[in-house]
């Protein structure tokens, strides 16, 4: 067990803070909840503290909860591949570019680390080149979320990992909005971290609303489990 893994043996409180700017529409989101890595379970509630969110909530799920992949359940035979926990408590920087097919892109930078007993994910998001009447700024996404696989590979040069996955957002007209994610994680501290063999995280997310909440918000329940060493993933990164 890595030193960082010992911090995740029970339920851990989570705080998420995001400052965003998409096509000049500025907003802030605050989230609170808890994670239980034993089950790979996350329960979080997010509130837009600046009024109405200018983008659909589902487009931010990966930035919020896929940001705290340290709560993923790694089975016993895969614990030596868990970079995320091994970087704790000092944490990691997580940077992403998210390309929305036929639309704009998000760039995000987050620091994920322990502050006291709380796991904190502080994020800055910048979105550009979005169509004002497109699926994102036009709020045409359904309020739901599909299951996905998140592909992880070691980045030995940067003592971290590279990650790729493609999200399928359901559109109200029955079509799909694709969002291709490119992610890089690097440790904040200088202690040893686990550099994994290639594998993936299997994610399942459910979005809901709090009937007593008047503000624009999202309630998220998520389960994430690490799974098989996938074939072929090393070819590009030899």
């Amino acid at each position: 067990m890595s030193k960082g893994e010992e911090l995740f043996t029970g339920v851990v409180p989570i705080l998420v803070e995001l400052d965003g700017d998409v096509n000049g529409h500025k907003f802030s989101v605050s989230g609170e909840g808890e994670g239980d890595a034993t089950y790979g379970k996350l329960t979080l509630k997010f509130i837009c503290t600046t009024g109405k969110l200018p983008v659909p909530w589902p487009t931010l799920v990966t930035t919020f909860s896929y940001g705290v992949q340290c709560f993923s359940r790694y089975p016993d035979h895969m614990k030596q591949h868990d970079f995320f926990k091994s970087a704790m408590p000092e944490g990691y920087v997580q940077e992403r570019t998210i390309f929305f097919k036929d639309d704009g892109n998000y760039k995000t930078r987050a620091e994920v680390k322990f502050e006291g007993d709380t796991l904190v994910n502080r994020i800055e998001l910048k979105g550009i080149d979005f169509k004002e009447d497109g699926n994102i700024l036009g709020h045409k996404l359904e309020y739901n979320y599909n299951s996905h696989n998140v592909y992880i590979m070691a980045d030995k040069q940067k003592n971290g990992i590279k990650v790729n996955f493609k999200i399928r957002h359901n559109i109200e007209d029955g079509s799909v909005q694709l969002a291709d994610h490119y992610q890089q994680n690097t440790p904040i501290g200088d202690g040893p971290v686990l550099l994994p063999d290639n594998h993936y995280l299997s994610t399942q997310s459910a979005l809901s609303k709090d009937p007593n909440e008047k503000r624009d918000h999202m309630v998220l329940l998520e389960f994430v489990t690490a799974a098989g060493i996938t074939h072929g993933m090393d070819e590009l990164y030899k």
């Epitope: 592909y151 291709d180 490119y182």
Partner: nanobody, 130 residues
Framework: QVQLVESGGGLVQAGGSLRLSCVTS????????IGWFRQAPGKEREGVSS????????YYADSVKGRFTISSDNAKNTVYLQMNNLKPEDTAVYYC???????????????????????WGQGTQVTVSS
Amino acid sequence: QVQLVESGGGLVQAGGSLRLSCVTSGFTFDDYAIGWFRQAPGKEREGVSSISSSDGTTYYADSVKGRFTISSDNAKNTVYLQMNNLKPEDTAVYYCAADWAAWPSIRVGVGVPAYEYDYWGQGTQVTVSS
């Protein structure tokens, strides 16, 4: 609209060769990884090979390495699968599929499974007799 049309399948004896073609239309070729998959009766669809036409990155399943070669002709928006030294266990319907990505080469390097692909052709039958 998006179309992928496979051709080149047929009946061949073990040790023989076939060249499959996948002609694509309706999308920007360079924005996609193109993959070949196959499905034998009663079995799951499995990945065979894939290519990023933008930079030539390729992926091969272990079972076909050294025997199959994938290539693309960007001017014709076409991907080819040259299959040599065919074996009876290569018998299957072969499908061509397209996977949109901002950087297709990374998707190819990942060797993503069938359900990650966005568009599919109708398939072409390959039968290898012993």
